[in-house]
């Protein structure tokens, strides 16, 4: 079956002077494109027609998902976040088979103090959440645990949690040396063993928000780019007005090619528009209109 | 979950002698520590006496030669026999356990308390 559609069309003149339609009003032409059973031969760019309209793929949309969007949404994490596997050894405790059974009163009064503990020494630190025991052995107590931290995020988040990192290190370096036993005594919440102290791993949340734009873009990843607003970033072409990168059509209009951003000019009823940015403008001659 | 009940506290004369309990319910008594606290008025809580099942024992400086810890295991029961008292032993005599074997005299690492019992001493 044939599907008759109007479109009404303006004269725009790309800026390497050919003249092209796009979409605009008043002037009716009639359209005609074939439909097959339920798909939509019109949705390119592997848009697929749903029975009402073309459902697009990022970053197209339109009619006939012809046209690439100005701007690609994102989405960074609202917090990102650190790992850090440390291993201390408490001196104040003995060891005992009940302390590697994590369901026993045992475990339990440990868990209980150490992360009382551990509460204390990060208490300055506003990027702690808390500490996750993960295994108890030998030695008095060996401790290895994992130091959760945690952060809004901003552009500058990995700095912000590298910077954490290093003061947890600081700070149990501190109380692992100055918290050590006294004739087999401990005054302190918990004793430890200086030299026990270690950070095994440190694993910090990965979001690059640049590499999103560029995969989301897909083959327009060389001219999408991302510019932040309040610490939030938005992927954008040159065609979307508001940023550094916004580029002015001035008399004409901005769509993005494969070849990246250009200016589609106007023409009206007083002037034609040349120039990369349509900024040229040549009145035409007058002549008479007979009503 | 340990359950502690102190009892036995009491008012005496400057030299003279208390022996305060500690009964335990529950299953743990054969492990872990144990150990009496004291509260002096306007002051922090101080160890006085701990006992930890590897036979580790702790005295406060004050008490050495003077006050014993002791437990007897089938009545789940913990005491402490104080004994040449000074009115600067005048205070809250608490009992503590813990399920850990500990070697900590700070009181925020044991986990299960007595109510207390007082123990006054006049010279």
């Known amino acids: 079956p044939l599907a008759t559609i109007p479109v009404s069309t303006t004269s725009l003149t790309s800026s390497e002077g050919s003249t092209i339609s796009t979409p605009s009003v008043d002037i009716s032409t009639p359209v005609t494109t074939s439909i097959v059973g339920d798909q939509c031969s019109r949705c390119k760019n592997g848009g697929f027609w749903d029975g009402l309209k073309c459902q697009c793929l990022t970053p197209y949309y339109g009619e006939s998902c012809e046209e690439v969007v100005n701007s690609i949404d994102i989405a960074p994490p609202e917090t990102v976040s650190a790992q850090m596997e440390l291993t201390v050894t408490v001196t104040s405790v003995k060891f005992t088979d009940e302390l590697k059974n994590h369901s026993s009163q045992e475990f339990r009064e440990f868990n209980k103090t150490f992360t009382e503990q551990m509460n204390i020494v990060y208490s300055g630190i506003p990027e702690y959440v808390g500490v996750n025991i993960t295994n108890l052995r030998l030695g008095s107590v060996v401790v290895e645990h994992d130091v959760l931290l945690r952060t809004k995020y901003t552009p500058e988040y990995k700095t912000a949690l590298d910077n954490a990192t290093e003061v947890v290190k600081q700070k149990i370096t501190k109380v692992t040396t100055e918290q050590i036993m006294t004739n087999d005594n401990c005054s302190a919440l918990m004793c430890f063993n200086t030299t026990g102290t270690q950070v095994q791993n440190i694993t910090v949340t990965q979001y690059d928000p640049v590499e999103e734009c560029r995969q989301k873009a897909e083959e327009y990843e060389d001219y999408f780019l991302v510019e932040y607003r309040d610490q939030k970033p938005y992927c954008i072409s040159p065609c979307e007005s508001g940023f550094n990168a916004s580029k002015n059509c001035n008399h004409g209009k901005c769509q993005m090619s494969q070849n990246g951003a250009r200016c589609l000019c106007v023409t009206t009823e007083t002037h034609w528009y040349s120039g990369e940015d349509c900024n040229q403008g040549t009145q035409k001659s007058h002549h008479h209109h007979h009503h | 979950e340990v359950q502690l009940q102190a009892s036995g506290g009491g008012s005496v004369q400057a030299g003279g002698s208390l022996r305060v309990s500690c009964a335990a319910s529950?299953?743990?008594?054969?492990?872990?520590?144990w150990g009496w606290f004291r509260q002096r008025p306007g002051k922090e809580r101080e160890a006085v006496a701990l006992?930890?099942?590897?036979?580790?024992?702790f005295y406060a400086d004050s008490v050495k030669g003077r006050f014993t810890i002791s437990q007897d295991n089938t009545k789940n029961t913990l005491y402490l026999q104080m004994i040449s008292l000074r009115p600067e032993d005048t205070a809250m005599y608490y009992c503590?356990?813990?399920?850990?074997?500990?070697?900590?005299?700070?009181?925020?690492?044991?986990?299960?308390w007595g109510q207390g019992t007082q123990v006054t001493v006049s010279s």
């Open positions: 529950g299953d743990t008594f054969s492990r872990g520590s």
């Open positions: 006992i930890s099942s590897d036979g580790w024992t």
């Open positions: 503590a356990a813990s399920v850990l074997v500990l070697r900590t005299l700070n009181p925020k690492a044991w986990h299960h």
